[in-house]
């Protein structure tokens, strides 16, 4: 299938609230396009799907209601936010982009963004 370049940052540090955001950028041939974006997590040579959304250029990007991902699109960029992350979720998050319409179908897979998640230290009990 036709390959497409996808760019994403190498490293992102999640916030103390377990939220990580990064931009996934791809090369699209036009405005009349429908795009499917999938976030994959690679850890210990296992690849699992984190979330996915299909959207038309110029329309909002909508994930399923129970998804841990949210996002917005602007031109050939998708701004992805993953929430509810914990230290055990540290890993390589790969952005996969498919140009579903118009034909021909294109597929692009980024090199991945290493997301580091550090669980916040519990607040010590304070005695007064």
């Amino acid at each position: 299938c036709k390959a497409m370049h996808v760019a994403q940052p190498a490293v992102v540090l999640a916030s103390s609230r377990g939220i990580a955001s990064f931009v996934c950028e791809y090369a699209s041939p036009g405005k009349a396009t429908e795009v499917r974006v999938t976030v994959l997590r690679q850890a210990d040579s296992q690849v699992t799907e984190v979330c996915a959304a299909t959207y038309m250029m110029g329309n909002e990007l909508t994930f399923l209601d129970d998804s841990i991902c949210t996002g917005t699109s602007s031109g050939n960029q998708v701004n992805l936010t993953i929430q509810g992350l914990r230290a055990m979720d540290t890993g390589l998050y790969i952005c996969k982009v498919e140009l579903m319409y118009p034909p021909p179908y294109y597929l692009g897979i980024g090199n991945g963004t290493q997301i580091y998640v550090i669980d916040p230290e519990p607040c010590p009990d304070s005695d007064f």
């Epitope: 299938c1 396009t33 038309m56 110029g58 034909p103 021909p104 179908y105």
Partner: antibody, heavy 120, light 112 residues
Framework: QVQLVQSGAEVKKPGASVKVSCKAS????????INWVKQAPGQGLEWIGD????????NSNQKFEGKATLTVDKSISTAYMELRRLRSDDTAVYYC?????????????WGQGTLVTVSS | DIVMTQSPLSLPVTPGEPASISCRSS???????????LYWYLQKPGQSPQLLIY???NLASGVPDRFSSSGSGTDFTLKISRVEAEDVGVYYC?????????FGGGTKLEIK
């Protein structure tokens, strides 16, 4: 229920222009591409092009470039196709149709068609 | 452009009998993603076309299961197990592997 209702039949003279409308209802207009298809009398189907209702972006059959212009008005959920410099071989029924991603971008709902007759 | 060729041009069938329509594409419609970008539409007399089959072998919603479709990358067959009077019309195959989308010339199914 999903409906695509097209404007009525038109009779035009050669060299004139015509604008055909396609009013969508029963679904979110900006969630689906609209395609346009030509069917000359007694002939088969010919794809003209499509339009993304969100931003007006189009894909078109090179054969119809300079002939057909596709536009939308999101506020009234309507797609338009304007045909310019009409000739006798533009005489045809023109259909609008909705693309459905669940059917891998097949045309799942069609308008009733608009007959455009070009005659001097 | 991908050329879609259908045969026969006309198909007279007795009600209750099976029918078969062939479609050939000038290029393989089987993509490396595993999807075959082949569709079938039916245009009943005086009506707009309607979708029958998508992705070569999947029935669209509301299409009776007497319809089926199969094929390879370039050769496809639409079968009706038992033809009914309401099946009359012109059947078109179509592809959307590449732009422009193209249709076959049509096969007219009529009742004997």
């Amino acid at each position: 229920q999903v409906q695509l209702v097209q404007s009525g039949a038109e009779v035009k003279k050669p060299g004139a222009s015509v604008k055909v409308s396609c009013k969508a209802s029963g679904y979110k207009f900006t969630d689906h591409f609209i395609n346009w298809v030509k069917q000359a009398p007694g002939q088969g189907l010919e794809w003209i092009g499509d339009i993304n209702p969100n931003n007006g972006g189009t894909n078109s059959n090179q054969k119809f470039e300079g002939k057909a212009t596709l536009t939308v008005d999101k506020s009234i959920s309507t797609a338009y196709m304007e045909l310019r410099r009409l000739r006798s071989d533009d005489t045809a029924v023109y259909y609008c149709a909705r693309l459905r991603r669940e059917y891998f971008y097949a045309m799942d709902y069609w308008g009733q068609g608009t007959l455009v007759t070009v005659s001097s | 452009d991908i050329v879609m060729t259908q045969s026969p041009l006309s198909l007279p069938v007795t009600p209750g009998e099976p029918a078969s329509i062939s479609c050939r594409s000038s290029k393989s419609l089987l993509h490396s993603n595993g999807i075959t970008y082949l569709y079938w539409y039916l245009q009943k007399p005086g009506q707009s076309p309607q979708l029958l089959i998508y992705q070569m072998s999947n029935l669209a919603s509301g299409v009776p299961d007497r319809f089926s479709s199969s094929g390879s990358g370039t050769d496809f067959t639409l079968k009706i197990s038992r033809v009914e009077a309401e099946d009359v019309g012109v059947y078109y195959c179509a592809q959307n592997l590449e732009l422009p989308l193209t249709f076959g010339g049509g096969t007219k199914l009529e009742i004997k």
